[in-house]
Interface confidence: medium
């Protein structure tokens, strides 16, 4: 045995591997260094999850993951004397954590959340297959800017879906949106299996509708100017401009990726305002415009949730039918 062992020699396994849950979905494994490790070994720890995913070699004796605890999750940990991935680590020690007890068929399904206008989050879910129709639900949530887990108070019904909404305002701190909201739904009586979800704050963002400020004609072009929803900068949004002409009964939709107010016809330097020129519009007919917006992948992971349509605004004259 002794202190002169070569660093390539397999190290003893780590000791006291344990697992705990913090918040709602932060799973933390901690362990102690191996007993009797070689004295000339600078200890590193090799770890991966049960499916051989997310391999990591690091000197820390802890590893954490943010994961919805709807399924069992296991971490395997071994020790080694270098950061070399090809070095054979010690015997791997495994520790698993299982989701809370309960009939899987009782857990709510379709649990999803949308961050509305970066100001409040609205989550909704469907009762589980084996659930009494009069089950009362509670939603709990946690994110980095909260000291403790909060209970959502505003439970509502929308058709067959249950839901709850809670305030969640974008903080000026630039790292705020790099985090997630952890969600858990269970019933008050403790009869159903809890369901978990993790909502990254860069996804599932639904802006408020924009507000049309001005429509004007210049030659045969229609200039549209609008105010973007609060909390969003224009470069983070894509737009859809819909123009309906009452006389020709045409319905044109323009997908706009950039909406700068650079033409002299547009009112300048108005904060958070975007503009678009619709070509070839007949000024002597009635044109009705509405706009919607969605987040783009320059700033967000998700670009699927359109806002509702803005209020319509019309310009031009309705011709008398003869």
């Amino acid at each position: 045995g002794g202190g002169g062992a070569a660093p390539t020699e397999t190290q003893p396994p780590v000791t006291n591997l344990s697992v705990s849950v913090e918040n709602l979905c932060t799973v933390i494994w901690t362990w102690n260094p191996p007993e009797g490790a070689s004295s000339n070994c600078s200890l590193w720890y090799f770890s991966h999850f049960g499916d051989k995913q997310d391999k990591k070699i690091a000197p820390e004796t802890r590893r954490s993951i943010e994961v919805p605890l709807n399924e069992r999750i296991c971490l395997q940990v071994g020790s080694q004397c270098s950061t070399n991935e090809s070095e054979k680590p010690s015997i791997l020690v495994e520790k698993c954590i299982s989701p809370p007890e309960g009939d899987p068929e009782s857990a709510v399904t379709e649990l999803q959340c949308i961050w509305h206008n970066l100001s409040y989050m609205k989550c909704s879910w469907l009762p589980g297959r084996n659930t009494s129709p009069d089950t009362n639900y509670t939603l709990y949530y946690w994110h980095r800017s909260l000291e403790k887990i909060h209970q959502c108070e505003n439970i509502f019904r929308e058709g067959q879906y249950f839901g709850c909404s809670f305030d969640l305002t974008k903080v000026k701190d630039s790292s705020f949106e790099q985090h997630s909201v952890q969600i858990m739904v269970k019933d008050n009586a403790g009869k159903i299996k809890p369901s978990f979800n993790i909502v990254p704050l860069t996804s599932r963002v639904k802006p408020d509708p924009p507000h049309i400020k001005n429509l004007s004609f210049h030659n045969d072009d229609l200039y549209v100017q609008w105010e973007n929803p609060q909390n969003f900068i224009s470069r983070c949004l894509f737009y859809e401009v819909e123009v309906n002409n009452s006389q020709t009964e045409t319905h044109n939709v323009f997908y706009v990726q950039e909406a700068k107010c650079e033409n002299p016809e547009f009112e300048r330097n108005v904060e958070n305002t975007s503009c678009f020129m619709v070509p070839g519009v007949l000024p002597d007919t009635l044109n009705t415009v509405r706009i919607r917006v969605k987040t783009n992948k320059l700033c967000y992971e998700d670009d699927k949730l359109w806002s509702n349509w803005s209020q319509e605004m019309s310009i031009g004259k309705k011709r008398n039918s003869t």
Epitope: P127, R129, P133, Y161
Partner: antibody, heavy 119, light 107 residues
Framework: EVQLLESGGGLVQPGGSLRLSCAAS????????MNWVRQAPGKGLEWVSV????????YYADSVKGRFTISRDNSKNTLYLQMNSLRADDTAVYYC????????????WGQGTLVTVSS | DIQMTQSPSSLSASVGDRVTITCRAS??????VAWYQQKPEKAPKSLIY???SLQSGVPSRFSGSGSGTDFTLTISSLQPEDFATYYC?????????FGQGTKVEIK
Amino acid sequence: EVQLLESGGGLVQPGGSLRLSCAASGFTFNIYAMNWVRQAPGKGLEWVSVISGRGITTYYADSVKGRFTISRDNSKNTLYLQMNSLRADDTAVYYCAKGSSSWTDFDYWGQGTLVTVSS
Amino acid sequence: DIQMTQSPSSLSASVGDRVTITCRASQGISRWVAWYQQKPEKAPKSLIYAASSLQSGVPSRFSGSGSGTDFTLTISSLQPEDFATYYCQQYNSYPWTFGQGTKVEIK
């Protein structure tokens, strides 16, 4: 006023396929589960399948599992039932039925469309 | 699967009669039973849900009761338009199942 209008029924040979549609109006379609329930000639009612409002969750009766597929297009307010490997005992009037707010019983029914499986 | 057994399978009654139809579940289903009315060549119509709650627009002569395994649909004073077939349905657990029906005929 809630209205459900089925279509797509007809005569089909055993082993054949058919796709039923149900056009819905008069309610917010995408927040209610929709069902297919069938009734063989002179017989009682048999629940066939259900799909949740967002179209994510589906359940089937054992008698049709693996052969029938329920789906919906919320942009068109339309429910579908794709029926494959049809058998003589699938002959029935097929009703689409709206789930109530508890997504379990049926508060509105369509008028039904007849599917006949025969050679 | 939960079996729903209705009785009687048919009955004859006169206008003004009080009519009672029972439905027995093969296992306890709390109060998760609905009742439907079906007339010949027509779609079923919802009458009662959650054992005793009247669907909107349904006349108050219809009432439901029961919990656990035994459920009852009562028509307090039979009207000409009530001659039809009545079905119970359980929605406590999948697959949802119906009773075999009770035909109410004119005596």
